[in-house]
C-alpha cells in the first residue's frame, strides 16, 4: 500500500566509521519528504530527521547510547506539503533498513601515528588513540576505551632504502621494535579487530618516516 505520488525509500544503507553513523537511502525526493525512525530490537521507535528532503540521517546520537545493541531503522515517505496523508492501510509508506550492530560493524577509521622515538637500536612507535562519539560519564571514549582487548594494531615498517616490509602487532597502542643502527625506517599502522567477520581492518595510516618531524632520535 502507499500514498499517491510517493515512492518507498530503497537501498537503505548504514555508513558508520568509529561509531559516527549515518543512514543513507534512495531516491532523491520528488514531491515527497522523509522521516526516519530507529529502534533496538526490544525498544520503542524514535523519530529523527523529520520531514526531510535529504537522503541521509545522522543516527549517531542514538546508537552511541549502547553500541552493543542491534538497531533497526525505517524510512517513511510522505507527500510534500501533505505529511498527514497516509496510504490505504492507514499508514505512510516505509522501508526497513538492514539490522546494524555498531560494535560488530562500524568501520575502523584510518589510524594516525602519533610519534616515534628511537633509542639506540629500538624504536617506540605510538598510535594515536582516536576519540569516538561514545560517551561515558560525560567524557568521550577513545577507540581503545570502547574496543578494549578486541582491538589490536599492526605495524608495517621498512628501511627507507628498500621495499621489504616487516610487521609487528600490539594489543596496546605502542610498538617497540628492533632496527638496524644508522638506517632510516618508514612506518604505517592498521587497526584490526581479529574477532570480526566484517570490517575487520582499517585502511593503513599515512606513512611516517624517520628523519621527519614526528620522530625523535636519541643515540644511546
Amino acid at each position: 500500500s502507499g500514498t499517491t505520488n510517493t515512492v518507498a525509500a530503497y537501498n537503505l544503507t548504514w555508513k558508520s566509521t568509529n561509531f559516527k553513523t549515518i543512514l543513507e537511502w534512495e531516491p532523491k525526493p520528488v514531491n515527497q519528504v522523509y522521516t526516519v525512525q530507529i529502534s533496538t530490537k526490544s525498544g520503542d521507535w524514535k523519530s529523527k530527521c523529520f520531514y526531510t528532503t535529504d537522503t541521509e540521517c545522522d543516527l549517531t546520537d542514538e546508537i552511541v547510547k549502547d553500541v552493543k545493541q542491534t538497531y533497526l531503522a525505517r524510512v517513511f515517505s510522505y507527500p510534500a506539503g501533505n505529511v498527514e496523508s497516509t496510504g490505504s492501510a492507514g499508514e505512510p509508506l516505509y522501508e526497513n533498513s538492514p539490522e546494524f550492530t555498531p560494535y560488530l560493524e562500524t568501520n575502523l577509521g584510518q589510524p594516525t601515528i602519533q610519534s616515534f622515538e628511537q633509542v639506540g637500536t629500538k624504536v617506540n612507535v605510538t598510535v594515536e588513540d582516536e576519540r569516538t562519539l561514545v560517551r561515558r560519564n560525560n567524557t568521550f571514549l577513545s577507540l581503545r576505551d570502547v574496543f578494549g582487548k578486541d582491538l589490536i594494531y599492526t605495524l608495517y615498517y621498512w628501511k627507507s632504502s628498500s621495499s621489504g616490509k616487516k610487521t609487528a602487532k600490539t594489543n596496546t597502542n605502542e610498538f617497540l621494535i628492533d632496527v638496524d643502527k644508522g638506517e632510516n625506517y618508514c612506518f604505517s599502522v592498521q587497526a584490526v579487530i581479529p574477532s570480526r567477520t566484517v570490517n575487520r581492518k582499517s585502511t593503513d595510516s599515512p606513512v611516517e618516516c624517520m628523519g621527519q618531524e614526528k620522530g625523535e632520535f636519541r643515540e644511546i
Epitope: 530490537k41 552493543k68 545493541q69 542491534t70 550492530t101 560494535y103 560488530l104 561514545v134 561515558r136 571514549l141 581503545r144 576505551d145 570502547v146 574496543f147 578494549g148 582487548k149 594489543n171 596496546t172 581479529p194 574477532s195 570480526r196 567477520t197
Partner: antibody, heavy 121, light 109 residues
C-alpha cells in the same frame, strides 16, 4: 536483565565427551564474549576459553587445546562448550560468564549457575 | 603461560580497610590486562565485582574499588563487613587468554 542458564549435571566415564550449554537472555547475544571457567572441588577458578557469538571467533586456554570446542547457536542464543577425552581431574563445576560492558569492561561480571560434571568409572 | 599471584589469605577487622593485590609473573600489570576481581562466598556462585581494572558492576557496593598501584592490580575494600568474608579471585588478560590468580581468602574478624 542478563541471564545465563546452564544445562544440568552430567556424569561421564573417562575417555568420553561432555557438552555443556549456556542459554543467554536479556541482551544482544551476538555482541558479548562468553567465557568458560571451571572450578574443581575445593580449588580455584580456571579459564578454559571464550567465544564471541556474532562471529563464532574463539580463543582457548593452551592447556585445553585439542580437547575443548566452543560453538554457538544464534537462533536459540545458546553457547556450547564440549570437552573430550575426559579424565577424573576434569571433575569440576563448569561456568559460563559474561562481562558487564561499560566502555571496555571485559571479563567475568555475570555468571551462570554452573554445571557439575563428574568423571568417574 | 603467565602466573598471576595473590596473597593466599588476609584478615581485616570489621569497619577496617584492606588491600588485595594481584601480581603478574611477566612484569607490571597495566590497563591492557583488564584486571577483573571476582568474589566467591562459601558454597555460592562466583560474582563479578570489578572488570576492566576499575569498573564496578551495577551490583557492586562502592566500598570496593579497583585500581593499578605501581606494578600490580589492587582491590581495596573500605569499611569491611562480615558479609565480605569470601575468596577473591583476580584475572588478567594476556593478549589472547585470561589467567586467574589462586585467590585470596579474606577473613573479617
Amino acid at each position: 536483565q542478563v541471564q545465563l542458564q546452564e544445562s544440568g549435571a552430567e556424569v561421564k566415564k573417562p575417555g568420553a565427551s561432555v557438552k555443556v550449554s549456556c542459554k543467554a537472555s536479556g541482551y544482544t547475544f551476538s555482541s558479548y564474549w562468553i567465557e568458560w571457567v571451571r572450578q574443581a572441588p575445593g580449588q580455584g577458578l580456571e579459564w578454559m576459553g571464550e567465544i564471541l557469538p556474532g562471529s563464532a571467533s574463539t580463543k582457548y586456554n593452551e592447556k585445553f587445546k585439542g580437547r575443548v570446542t566452543m560453538t554457538r547457536d544464534t537462533s536459540t542464543s545458546t553457547v556450547y562448550m564440549e570437552l573430550s577425552s575426559l579424565r577424573s581431574e576434569d571433575t569440576a563445576v563448569y561456568y559460563c560468564a559474561r562481562d558487564y560492558y561499560y566502555g571496555s569492561s571485559y571479563g567475568f561480571a555475570y555468571w551462570g549457575q554452573g554445571t557439575l560434571v563428574t568423571v568417574s568409572s | 603461560q603467565a602466573v598471576v599471584t595473590q596473597e593466599p589469605s588476609l584478615t581485616v577487622s570489621p569497619g577496617g580497610t584492606v588491600t588485595l593485590t594481584c601480581r603478574s609473573s611477566t612484569g607490571a600489570v597495566t590497563t591492557s590486562n583488564y584486571a577483573n576481581w571476582v568474589q566467591q562466598k562459601p558454597g555460592q556462585l562466583p560474582k563479578g565485582l570489578i572488570s576492566g581494572t576499575n569498573n564496578r558492576g551495577p551490583w557492586t557496593t562502592a566500598r570496593f574499588s579497583g585500581s593499578i598501584l605501581g606494578d600490580k592490580a589492587v582491590l581495596t575494600l573500605w569499611g569491611a563487613h562480615t558479609e565480605d568474608e569470601a575468596v577473591y579471585y583476580c584475572a588478567l588478560w594476556y593478549s589472547n587468554h585470561w589467567v586467574f590468580g589462586g585467590g585470596t581468602k579474606l577473613t573479617v574478624l
